[in-house]
């Protein structure tokens, strides 16, 4: 079930998912001057069975000027830079992405991909927050947010994070030492 709202915005902080729950959709967006190939996929979709999850469909971009040249997934080293999204922030290639059952890893970039990724999360997805450079994290609790559903309405829990002052950046889970990121809450209706 899709989350019909966005993770909370925390001043001076960004968020990302360590892994994506099955059902997550990623828009196939192309950078300026390029467009999706005709009959190309609109979205990549995280799908799978009990043992393995992967991204279905392939995003392909072609030059808006030419008709038939297709550009497929060929990651270039210079393309591995961090990307943020309009709707759902999630930088590329997190350091630690545990192979959680029912989750997909960050998809590799495709050629001429837009600079911003737009994810559509599902109920049970967890995202993690960190303070931007120059701000220090004051934790009152977990710096994470989970999409939950109650009475058919979706909402993200409020992360217990305040970013303050002029200090070194805090880190996402797993960036200090490798460890499995916590599994997202089960996708079920919260009791009313």
């Amino acid at each position: 079930e899709l989350c019909d709202d966005d993770p909370p915005e925390i001043p001076h902080a960004t968020f990302k998912a360590m892994a994506y729950k099955e059902g997550t959709m990623l828009n196939c967006e192309c950078k300026r001057g390029f467009r999706r190939i005709k009959s190309g996929s609109l979205y990549m979709l995280c799908t799978g069975n009990s043992s393995h999850s992967s991204w279905d469909n392939q995003c392909q971009c072609t030059s808006s000027a030419t008709r038939n040249t297709t550009k497929q997934v060929t990651p270039q080293p210079e393309e591995q830079k961090e990307r943020k999204t309009t709707e759902m922030q999630s930088p590329m290639q997190p350091v630690d992405q545990a192979s959680l059952p029912g989750h997909c890893r960050e998809p590799p970039p495709w050629e001429n991909e837009a600079t911003e990724r737009i994810y559509h999360f599902v109920v049970g997805q967890m995202v993690y927050y960190q303070c931007v450079q120059g701000y220090r994290a004051l934790h009152r609790g977990p710096a994470e947010s989970v999409c939950k559903m109650t009475h058919g309405k979706t909402r993200w829990t409020q992360p217990q994070l305040i970013c303050t002052g002029e200090m070194e950046t805090s880190q996402f889970p797993g960036e200090e030492k490798p460890q499995a990121s916590p599994e997202g809450r089960p996708e079920s209706e919260t009791s009313c």
Partner: antibody
Framework: QVQLVQSGAEVKKPGSSVKVSCKAS????????MHWVRQAPGQGLEWIGY????????EYNQKFKDKATITADESTNTAYMELSSLRSEDTAVYYC?????????WGQGTLVTVSS | DIQMTQSPSTLSASVGDRVTITCSAS?????MHWYQQKPGKAPKLLIY???NLASGVPARFSGSGSGTEFTLTISSLQPDDFATYYC?????????FGQGTKVEVK
């Protein structure tokens, strides 16, 4: 109480455009996406797309990508949907519906008739 | 796109009858939602997340199912229940609805 009040019925010529409004009250407008749904005469419901009023971000059903443009005005708590290059097949009732999950509140609908 | 197929398209029934409407999704979905619509009116949320009754909906309505097969049941049809019913999925974009089932007087 939550209310979504839509603009009145419109009769338009083929090739023209129309802008339907949906004024929200009784809740925080920017806290919920606003979705639009079409119902052609005697037909079922079709999802057109949504807008996130706080960011202006839109997502469309590909079928309506070149037909509908959804916007929102935070200052008046109003969502809009403009339909362009109208054809007779666009004759339908257009509904706005509050998102955030299931559509628990709907506008009363706006009938757009396209006729020469 | 996930196609939603409702059956039957039209159902003729009498007050007091037990009525069952089925909805099949072309792919597995998390939940099904159901709306009721009367002529000239906007749809009204009836059942959300497969089996939960929306506020003010009588207990004679119930929903069940999982995966690709879902059911809406009215245990004892009342005069106010003659309407068109739509199933709806919001597990993936584009969001889709069934074509509708019209419950009419026999």
């Amino acid at each position: 109480q939550v209310q979504l009040v839509q603009s009145g019925a419109e009769v338009k010529k083929p090739g023209s455009s129309v802008k339907v409004s949906c004024k929200a009250s009784g809740y925080t407008f920017t806290s919920y996406r606003m979705h639009w749904v079409r119902q052609a005469p005697g037909q079922g419901l079709e999802w057109i797309g949504y807008i996130n009023p706080s960011k202006g971000y839109t997502e469309y059903n590909q079928k309506f990508k070149d037909k509908a443009t959804i916007t929102a005005d935070e200052s008046t708590n109003t969502a809009y949907m403009e339909l362009s290059s109208l054809r007779s097949e666009d004759t339908a009732v257009y509904y706005c519906a509050r998102g955030g999950g299931v559509f628990d509140y709907w506008g009363q609908g706006t009938l757009v008739t396209v006729s020469s | 796109d996930i196609q939603m197929t409702q059956s039957p398209s039209t159902l003729s029934a009498s007050v007091g009858d037990r009525v069952t409407i089925t909805c099949s999704a072309s792919s597995s979905i998390s939940y099904m939602h159901w709306y009721q619509q009367k002529p000239g009116k906007a749809p009204k949320l009836l059942i959300y997340t497969t089996s939960n009754l929306a506020s003010g909906v009588p207990a004679r309505f119930s929903g069940s199912g999982s995966g690709t097969e879902f059911t809406l049941t009215i245990s004892s049809l009342q005069p106010d229940d003659f309407a068109t019913y739509y199933c709806h999925q919001r597990s993936t974009y584009p969001l889709t609805f069934g074509q509708g089932t019209k419950v009419e007087v026999k």
